[in-house]
């Protein structure tokens, strides 16, 4: 297993609709054809897997149908979008990149993107 540098923004504020997008850029030492991207969430000292996708270079990322993540790839960067976020989902979202094929296997873990989610104010009751 060889180490690889992964860069991602330090902080992002989700939209009022609970959508957050961020880039995950990796310094690929070789010509990988198969890449796996995993998003991990760290909060309250707990780390959980949010979503993961394996893709072939030049193809779209494919997450599971029920995943809250979508993404696109371009060269050595992946643009990730997480939707359906609420204030309780605020936390550090860490991008993990694995170059699966061809060998050697490379692993890179970013410092994480702190995503803040602010629930919208409830609309005041109207008389209509």
């Amino acid at each position: 297993c060889k180490a690889m540098h992964v860069a991602q923004p330090a902080v992002v504020l989700a939209s009022s609709r609970g959508i957050a997008s961020f880039v995950c850029e990796y310094a690929s030492p070789g010509k990988a054809t198969e890449v796996r991207v995993t998003v991990l969430r760290q909060a309250d000292s707990q780390v959980t897997e949010v979503c993961a996708a394996t893709y072939m270079m030049g193809n779209e990322l494919t997450f599971l149908d029920d995943s809250i993540c979508t993404g696109t790839s371009s060269g050595n960067q992946v643009n990730l979008t997480i939707q359906g976020l609420r204030a309780m989902d605020t936390g550090l979202y860490i991008c993990k990149v694995e170059l699966m094929y061809p060998p050697p296997y490379y692993l890179g873990i970013g410092n994480g993107t702190q995503i803040y989610v602010i629930d919208p104010e409830p609309c005041p009751d109207s008389d209509f």
Partner: antibody, heavy 116, light 108 residues
Framework: QVQLVQSGAEVKKPGASVKVSCKAS????????ISWVRQAPGQGLEWMGW????????NYVKKFQGRVTMTTDTSTNTAYMELRSLRSDDTAVYYC?????????WGQGTLVTVSS | EIVLTQSPATLSLSPGERATLSCGAS???????LAWYQQKPGLAPRLLIY???SRATGIPDRFSGSGSGTDFTLTISRLEPEDFAMYYC?????????FGQGTKVEIK
């Protein structure tokens, strides 16, 4: 090294607007947030809000909503805070600061005096 | 809005003594997202502690943060002459993010 350099002191009349600038250097500007905090003479710190430079999303404290606008220009690594309809109790030092989890770097502050 | 109450308002101590500053929240602070700052007259504040207990870069280890939920503490194990200043806590676990009113640590 990380630096945030703010524009100079301003004197404004009640009802006017002020726009304070904050030029960042020494780090990847759009990877961090910029927050704005003010401090009235002899008083404590007051959070005004922040902007996520990466996507331009903002979060303003309710008391300033409709009166404040925070923006950034990523081509010049500069953040701006505009406060409108100034009142005498807006007299304060306004700080810009880099935000992630806590404010780790601060500008030197801009004194805004509102007086007729 | 989460209201932060700092106590005491003023702490009079001598160099070498231990300082204990408290910050109480009106409701639980999510993920212990609480920071402590030091401010000296005429200067911008300086981040000491974030996430309740993580020391910021370059901060001496005599500063430590602890607590969770609604009760947080900043401890200065041995006061140095340069530590006499104002101290503010700030929560960023619930919008709007708020500061406490501050504790002044003065020389006795």
């Amino acid at each position: 090294q990380v630096q945030l350099v703010q524009s100079g002191a301003e004197v404004k009349k009640p009802g006017a607007s002020v726009k304070v600038s904050c030029k960042a250097s020494g780090y990847t500007f759009n990877y961090y947030g910029i927050s704005w905090v003010r401090q009235a003479p002899g008083q404590g710190l007051e959070w005004m809000g922040w902007i996520s430079v990466y996507n331009g999303n903002t979060n303003y404290v309710k008391k300033f909503q409709g009166r404040v606008t925070m923006t950034t220009d990523t081509s010049t690594n500069t953040a701006y805070m505009e406060l409108r309809s100034l009142r005498s109790d807006d007299t304060a030092v306004y700080y810009c600061a880099r935000w992630v989890r806590g404010v780790d770097y601060w500008g030197q502050g801009t004194l805004v005096t509102v007086s007729s | 809005e989460i209201v932060l109450t700092q106590s005491p308002a003023t702490l009079s101590l001598s160099p070498g003594e231990r300082a204990t500053l408290s910050c109480g929240a009106s409701q639980s602070v999510s993920s212990n997202y609480l920071a402590w700052y030091q401010q000296k007259p005429g200067l911008a504040p300086r981040l000491l502690i974030y996430d309740a207990s993580s020391r910021a870069t370059g901060i001496p280890d005599r500063f430590s943060g602890s607590g969770s939920g609604t009760d947080f503490t900043l401890t200065i194990s041995r006061l140095e002459p340069e530590d006499f200043a104002m101290y503010y806590c700030q929560q960023y676990g619930g919008s709007p993010w708020t500061f406490g009113q501050g504790t002044k640590v003065e020389i006795k």
